[in-house]
Interface confidence: medium
């Protein structure tokens, strides 16, 4: 399985387009990949053709932050994913115990100096193929055919929905590195990003215990996060190997 994925990665490298001619770098990603439910997958991006210094790499799944690799402070894994996400190899990310819900778009966001922000996209499809195959052996042919058809239809729907989402939110950032807006629930993870009205826009300015001074209703939830989030000693981010 892992060798297969490595082959897919080697053969399916895709280059993400850039928003500005000023940015010479390109992000190579594993492109569209698939994996089996319960298995694991490695998400890999590689920044090349630039001498820019990488200061931070974010891994995101649609609107959720999975992990951060910061040049100064190393890796941070979101508590929501800490049981199923492992840092590495390199600046990549390993997803474990995959579920069908993990199907979707993943983004590697490279923050660099002086270029700005580069974003790569990977589409992951988690399949229940082995479960469907083994289950069908014990069913009458008609039920087996129906189940197979259902899987195909579901897969098609997932792909269509994902492609629609992709069109709605193309995640290529400008040189200025403008941050995407996040829902109020995600502001806890990107607290100083541009925020919708009513969210705690100054959250990053307030360590734990200061939410009483903040505007918005998200601060009570934020208060809990300040004490539980921390960077783990998972090894330094070897950014110097990433550009060339």
């Amino acid at each position: 399985m892992r060798w297969c994925l490595l082959l897919i990665w080697a053969q399916g490298l895709r280059q993400a387009p850039l928003a500005s001619g000023m940015m010479t770098g390109t992000i190579e990603t594993t492109g569209n990949i698939s994996a089996e439910k319960g298995g694991s997958i490695i998400l890999q991006c590689h920044l090349s053709s630039t001498t820019a210094q990488v200061t931070q790499v974010n891994w995101e799944q649609q609107d959720q932050l999975l992990a951060i690799c910061n040049a100064d402070l190393g890796w941070h894994i979101s508590p929501s994913f800490k049981d199923r996400v492992a840092p590495g190899p390199g600046l990549g990310l390993t997803l474990q115990s995959l579920t069908v819900n993990d199907t979707g778009e993943y983004f590697c966001i490279y923050h660099t100096y002086p270029d700005g922000t580069y974003t790569g996209r990977i589409f992951l499809e988690v399949l229940e193929s082995s479960v469907a195959e083994h289950g069908a052996r014990f069913q009458i042919p008609l039920l087996g055919a129906m189940a197979a058809t259902l899987v195909v239809i579901c897969t098609a729907v997932i792909v269509v929905v994902a492609l629609t989402r992709k069109k709605k939110a193309l995640r290529i950032h400008s040189v200025e590195g403008d941050l995407r807006r996040k829902s109020a629930g995600q502001e806890e993870w990107s607290p100083s990003a541009p925020s919708p009205p009513g969210s705690c826009v100054q959250a990053e300015a307030a360590p734990a215990g200061l939410c009483g001074e903040q505007r918005g209703e998200d601060c009570a939830e934020l208060h809990d996060y300040f004490n539980v989030l921390s960077y783990r000693s998972l090894g330094n981010c070897s950014f110097f190997t990433e550009t060339g």
Partner: antibody, heavy 126, light 107 residues
Framework: EVQLVESGGGLVQPGGSLRLSCAAS????????MSWVRQAPGKTMEWIGN????????NYAPSLKNRFTISRDNAKNSLYLQMNSLRAEDTATYYC???????????????????WGQGTMVTVSS | DIQMTQSPSSLSASVGDRVTITCRTS??????LRWFQQKPGKAPKLLIH???NLANGVPSRFSGSGSGTDFTLTISSLQPEDFATYYC?????????FGQGTKLEIK
């Protein structure tokens, strides 16, 4: 290479004013929180305050809030500390420090201070 | 303000010694603590962040432990370049506050 260079220090009389500057290079200044920290001779460090990456939000040590003002000019990659009504006890080395990246976890603290300038000495004396 | 009590204020040790510096806070700060090293005439250098995490480029002989109100910086085997002053910093609550410092001298 990240560099922070403070300037503007010197001798000033009690009650006077002084404006310190910090020139930043080697990183995207507009992406980082910045802080000022001071250290009186032979004493521990004292956090003065910090400013959000876009300059829209500041925090100060309560004891200094009414006399000190932190500002920044992202176009010039510069951080400033305006000090008014100076007293003898303000005599110290003033450091400019780079805080955390704008979208990094709040748990990293308001002032990561991974990078520091070499400091500029301010002497308040008559 | 959160009060920081750092001890000892000074310490004499020899190369190869194991040294422990403690920092106690007046209230629970979780793991929001950093340790800095400062040499005379120089700016402080970050050693430990998040109470236990080694900053990039810092030798593995340095380690941090503790959470809540009691924290420890340990140098497993002192090297000549480790003789300096060490400070703890809490960043759980404004204003950020530093410990009084521990001056580590050669015995």
């Amino acid at each position: 290479e990240v560099q922070l260079v403070e300037s503007g220090g010197g001798l000033v009389q009690p009650g006077g004013s002084l404006r310190l500057s910090c020139a930043a290079s080697g990183f995207t200044f507009s992406d980082h929180w910045m802080s000022w920290v001071r250290q009186a001779p032979g004493k521990t460090m004292e956090w003065i305050g910090n400013i959000q990456y876009d300059g829209s939000y500041t925090n100060y040590a309560p004891s200094l809030k009414n006399r000190f003002t932190i500002s920044r000019d992202n176009a010039k990659n510069s951080l400033y500390l305006q000090m008014n009504s100076l007293r003898a006890e303000d005599t110290a080395t003033y450091y400019c420090t780079r805080g955390h990246f704008r979208i990094t976890m709040a748990s990293m603290g308001a002032s990561a201070s991974v990078y520091w300038g070499q400091g500029t000495m301010v002497t308040v004396s008559s | 303000d959160i009060q920081m009590t750092q001890s000892p204020s000074s310490l004499s040790a020899s190369v190869g010694d194991r040294v422990t510096i403690t920092c106690r806070t007046s209230q629970d700060i979780g793991n929001s603590l950093r340790w800095f090293q400062q040499k005379p005439g120089k700016a402080p250098k970050l050693l430990i962040h998040g109470a236990t995490n080694l900053a990039n480029g810092v030798p593995s002989r340095f380690s941090g432990s503790g959470s809540g109100t009691d924290f420890t910086l340990t140098i497993s085997s002192l090297q000549p370049e480790d003789f300096a002053t060490y400070y703890c910093l809490q960043h759980n609550e404004y204003p950020l506050t530093f410990g009084q410092g521990t001056k580590l001298e050669i015995k």
